[in-house]
Interface confidence: low
């Protein structure tokens, strides 16, 4: 899906009002320094691409995020504010229904949600720079802290 046509300000509002709080709730009890951010994004469409992937694509050790409150609200925000997004997600919805119903919060899931928090913060104010470039005066570290 091409996220360049989304209404970023509306999605940002949804994040600030509810999604961010749900992410914090999910991470409650986890030390803010426990996980390092390894997933990055440089523009808001790119951030949404990464957010969608981490939120809805099952990964090894963490298959249950799609049923979490923050995921459902993320899905709703994308469906409402990204034209044509819903149509592309029919197969993904079927896969989500087949996911196991029990909510098991594994360490892998906590790490994944920690990455999501970082991506959402970058979506909120994108870094606007490619990662790993040594030719420029960049210091990304301050953007990698967790705020819980």
């Amino acid at each position: 899906y091409d996220f360049t046509n989304c209404d970023f300000e509306k999605i940002k509002a949804a994040y600030l009002s509810t999604i961010s709080k749900d992410l914090i709730t999910y991470m409650s009890g986890t030390k803010s320094t426990e996980f390092n951010n390894t997933v990055s994004c440089s523009n808001r469409p790119h951030c949404l691409t990464e957010i969608q992937s981490l939120t809805f694509n099952p990964t090894a050790g963490c298959a249950s995020l799609a049923k979490e409150m923050f995921a459902m609200k993320t899905k709703a925000a994308l469906a409402i504010w990204c034209p044509g997004y819903s149509e592309t997600q029919i197969n993904a919805t079927q896969a989500m229904k087949k996911a196991r119903k029990s909510k098991v919060t594994t360490n892998k899931c906590l790490e994944q949600v920690s990455q999501l928090q970082g991506l959402w913060r970058r979506f909120n104010r994108p870094l606007l720079k490619q990662q790993g470039s040594s030719d420029y005066k960049d210091d990304d570290d301050k953007h990698h802290h967790h705020h819980h």
Epitope: N43, R125, L128, Q130, K142
Partner: antibody, heavy 117, light 107 residues
Framework: QVQLQQSGPQLVRPGASVKISCKAS????????MHWVKQRPGQGLEWIGM????????TLIQKFKDKATLTVDKSSSTAYMQLSSPTSEDSAVYYC??????????WGQGTTLTVSS | DIQMTQSPASLSASVGETVTITCRAS??????LAWYQQKQGKSPQLLVY???TLAEGVPSRFSGSVSGTQFSLKINSLQPEDFGSYYC?????????FGGGTKLEIK
Amino acid sequence: QVQLQQSGPQLVRPGASVKISCKASGYSFTTYWMHWVKQRPGQGLEWIGMIDPSDSETTLIQKFKDKATLTVDKSSSTAYMQLSSPTSEDSAVYYCARTLDGYYDYWGQGTTLTVSS
Amino acid sequence: DIQMTQSPASLSASVGETVTITCRASENIYSYLAWYQQKQGKSPQLLVYFAKTLAEGVPSRFSGSVSGTQFSLKINSLQPEDFGSYYCQHHYGTPWTFGGGTKLEIK
């Protein structure tokens, strides 16, 4: 409405440092990055670098690392670019422009710098 | 660094004609490309961003498109106020780079 008001034209001697200002109004200054772009007479546009007004983090291309210094004054919502030891090669129009996703939706009116002895 | 090759460098056309300006990126920049118009002695003005999204207030005779690493700006039914210089710019990441520009003149 959003405005980026730049300082007026400047005539400087070679070697004398010069500072160009860009006063922002009509939006939250710290939400957008401020970029600087150079345009020599009759030439195209050249990206110099950018500054994040919220924490003054800067990114400059190699060519301008020893030439340009970018700063901001949050209290007055003003961005500055200082050019050190200017030569005739630095004679150009300099623009500030704001961005969130990398494209420039608002530009300053430009500051013409003339370096001449 | 990503290089942006813009063509043609100059173009003569008459009011009412349709013109297309192209820009090729040296590597994949997806849809991260903007187009600007600049009149003599004035600041550039944003026309298109994300390759095909029209900026606020830009007439619908302007349109952007993308095919791989080639980007196009099409101006239908040229108006007198459309003459000037046009620049493409990638906004995929640092360093931002611009195309060399296209000067659109009245025939």
